[in-house]
Amino acid sequence: IIGPGRVVGSRRRPPRKLVPLAYKQFSPNVPEKTLGASGRYEGKIARSSERFKELTPNYNPDIIFKDEENTGADRLMTQRCKDRLNSLAISVMNQWPGVKLRVTEGWDEDGHHSEESLHYEGRAVDITTSDRDRNKYGLLARLAVEAGFDWVYYESKAHVHCSVKSEHSAAAKTGG
């Protein structure tokens, strides 16, 4: 008789196979700024605005930031985005030893994204792998979904776009 909690045989269940996102695929399969994904745009955050304090810098040494502007802007993001990104950084290193997560765009103050981009409020990041091997980006997108980003889009040959719900809507949903 087998007692509770006992496992028959010594074989462990193989890890679930991760299916890469296809180019131009997004998950969940709804528009980014809808309730089932990252939710509505709440307005641009400027350095001078009161809401700027909602953004927190990410100094995770396991993440490489492109920081083309040399301002540190790409490191700024909401706490929810930071948590998901840090989780993804671990997944990337586990998936590809010697490779790190790389952020090409985070919070943007330059205004070169689309009109109501979540980059303007620190809720979106564009990511690649540190080796910039584009063959990896489909799987990187899947890892981002698994890391808990609220919307992931294999947007470009050159990057994967990830975004999160606002702190307010996320807190209301979890009751925290």
Epitope: K66, E68, N70, T71, H112, S156
Partner: antibody, heavy 123, light 105 residues
């Protein structure tokens, strides 16, 4: 609309430094997303990218020319410049300044070009 | 260093379709642009992002890119399309193809 205009000497002596300036009018060189670039074309030949600079000062150079090239930006004058040192006759070419845009992660394309200026290297 | 290869010349009759190819290792993973240059003039961007047309460029210009080959297609070619065409791709170092002379017979 944005326009680019190259300026500088048309004749440079061998071993000297070639210096060109590109003036941007009708728009700010500080605009994010643009890579201000230099491209040259030897007489009767194809195009060769020399290098690009972002308004923040980050520079990107053709590996084959890197040791001799310096590109700088002067945001106050809305200009960017090229310096190519130790020139030889092989550097004789039409030099274009151009505005690069990024399709992705350094996937540049050049949507605006100056008229070009012929620089001859000769003693 | 990365190289892009184009045929030196392509000929086409007026009204016909001209195809100019550009090949490079894993080119499909990169974004390709195409430029038209007429004698004595600066290059003009005709296709970017593999298949997008800048404003002012006629609809007869189209592009595609997959595998190791990108293609510029000019449908209903006109005499005014006679020019040199250059493909270009980048990866922190912009690279141009050698150019293709398009002759409209």
């Amino acid at each position: 609309q944005v326009q680019l205009q190259e300026s500088g000497p048309g004749l440079v002596k061998p071993s000297q430094t070639l210096s060109l300036t590109c003036t941007v009018s009708g728009g700010s060189i500080n605009s994010g997303g643009f890579y201000w670039s230099w491209i040259r074309q030897h007489p009767g030949k194809g195009l060769e990218w020399i290098g690009s600079i972002y308004y923040s000062g980050n520079t990107y150079y053709n590996p084959s020319l890197k040791s001799r090239v310096t590109i700088s930006v002067d945001t106050s004058k809305n200009q960017f410049s090229l310096k190519l040192s130790s020139v030889t006759a092989a550097d004789t070419a039409v030099y274009y300044c151009a505005r690069g845009q990024d399709s992705g992660d350094y996937d540049w394309y050049f949507d605006l070009w100056g008229r070009g200026t012929l620089v001859t290297v000769s003693s | 260093s990365y190289e892009l290869t184009q045929p030196p010349s392509v000929s086409v009759s007026p009204g016909q379709t001209a195809s100019i190819t550009c090949s490079g290792e894993k080119l499909g993973y990169k974004y390709v642009s195409w430029y038209q240059q007429k004698p004595g003039q600066s290059p003009v961007l005709v296709i970017y992002h593999d298949n997008k047309r800048p404003s002012g460029i006629p609809e007869r210009f189209s592009g595609s890119n997959s595998g190791n080959t990108a293609t510029l297609t000019i449908s209903g070619t006109q005499a005014m399309d006679e020019a040199d065409y250059y493909c270009q791709a980048g990866d922190s170092s912009a690279v141009f193809g050698g150019g293709t002379k398009l002759t409209v017979l």
